[in-house]
Amino acid sequence: MMTGTIETTGNISAEKGGSIILQCHLSSTTAQVTQVNWEQQDQLLAICNADLGWHISPSFKDRVAPGPGLGLTLQSLTVNDTGEYFCIYHTYPDGTYTGRIFLEVLESSVAEHGARFQIP
């Protein structure tokens, strides 16, 4: 039975040219996390494997910094980065948990960060 829940940064906005941290947290389960995948729609951004470390997709290679933690920092944002992002936690023995973040990249300088990542 899958008891875990994914908490995410939720809906966030950032300014064009800036950077943003995509962050998820798996709670309420003792399952072992073996890998975390970060995807944008159906495109793979990065993989963090417990044994092999990080792999960054070539198309994002120059502007992704792994971390903080299992999160992902996306730099040099463009309006094309607007959209849905998914953190996919592969765990044993529970299976797969998925969290969703929506990022809006704004042209103006009035972009405000949405819900900050905090565990209540």
């Epitope: 947290h25 709670s27 092999l52 470390g53 990080w54 971390g67 933690g69 299992l70």
Partner: antibody
Framework: QAYLQQSGAELVRSGASVKMSCKAS????????MHWVKQTPGQGLEWIGY????????TYSQKFKDKATLTADTSSSTAYMQISSLTSEDSAVYFC???????????WGQGTSVTVSS | QIVLTQSPEIMSASPGEKVTMTCSAS?????MHWYQQKSGTSPKRWIY???KLASGVPARFSGSGSGTSYSLTISSMEAEDSATFYC?????????FGAGTKLELK
């Protein structure tokens, strides 16, 4: 087993720069963040920043962004940190440490001692 | 930035005594990591992801906590446990450490 070997102690003049190295072995260097940490008796452990050798992207603590420069050479599995415009406050032991799964620093170098003389 | 406050700063314990030290975060974090450092050596990862023991760490050590409150416990103090213990978070940038708890043998 991962292992981090740091360069030897440095005695440098005030105002000069110093560049130290951290040679990694026992793992795929380009797949893990390399963090740098400063330790002084008065300040404890302070995070300087990190580099992801796979793409060279760096992130710095605000305090050190104009003081330290992080680089990495994947061909030799070596990370470097240069500290510029040295003052007595830069006298410390500097550690490199590998970023493990989940954000803990799982392997540490033995440290490089930097002494700034006037 | 997230400030980590460790208490006590210094403590002493007799062999066989139970020891608990705490780490309080200024904002909620998802995990806490702990390091042991002995004089003249580099820190060693000791407890990670709040409660997992690093390889080679004796089972008398344990970690627990959530949100803003975390702790490291030694069920029965031994002489070799004398060291300074640091907590660390990387929930957000910058990564931060606590100031450390120095544990001495009484």
């Amino acid at each position: 087993q991962a292992y981090l070997q740091q360069s030897g102690a440095e005695l440098v003049r005030s105002g000069a720069s110093v560049k130290m190295s951290c040679k990694a072995s026992g793992y795929t260097f380009s797949n893990y963040n390399m963090h740098w940490v400063k330790q002084t008796p008065g300040q404890g452990l302070e995070w300087i920043g990190y580099i992801f050798p796979g793409n060279g992207v760096t992130t710095y603590s605000q305090k050190f962004k104009d003081k330290a420069t992080l680089t990495a050479d994947t061909s030799s599995s070596t990370a470097y940190m240069q500290i510029s415009s040295l003052t007595s406050e830069d006298s410390a032991v500097y550690f490199c440490a590998r970023g493990g799964f989940g954000g803990a620093l799982d392997y540490w170098g033995q440290g490089t001692s930097v002494t700034v003389s006037s | 930035q997230i400030v980590l406050t460790q208490s006590p700063e210094i403590m002493s314990a007799s062999p066989g005594e139970k020891v608990t030290m705490t780490c309080s975060a200024s904002s909620s974090v998802s995990h806490m990591h702990w390091y042991q450092q002995k004089s003249g050596t580099s820190p060693k990862r000791w407890i990670y992801d709040t409660s997992k023991l690093a390889s080679g760490v004796p089972a008398r050590f344990s970690g627990s906590g959530s949100g803003t409150s975390y702790s490291l416990t030694i069920s029965s103090m031994e002489a070799e446990d004398s060291a300074t213990f640091y907590c660390q978070q990387w929930n957000n940038n910058p990564l931060t450490f606590g100031a450390g708890t120095k544990l001495e043998l009484k």
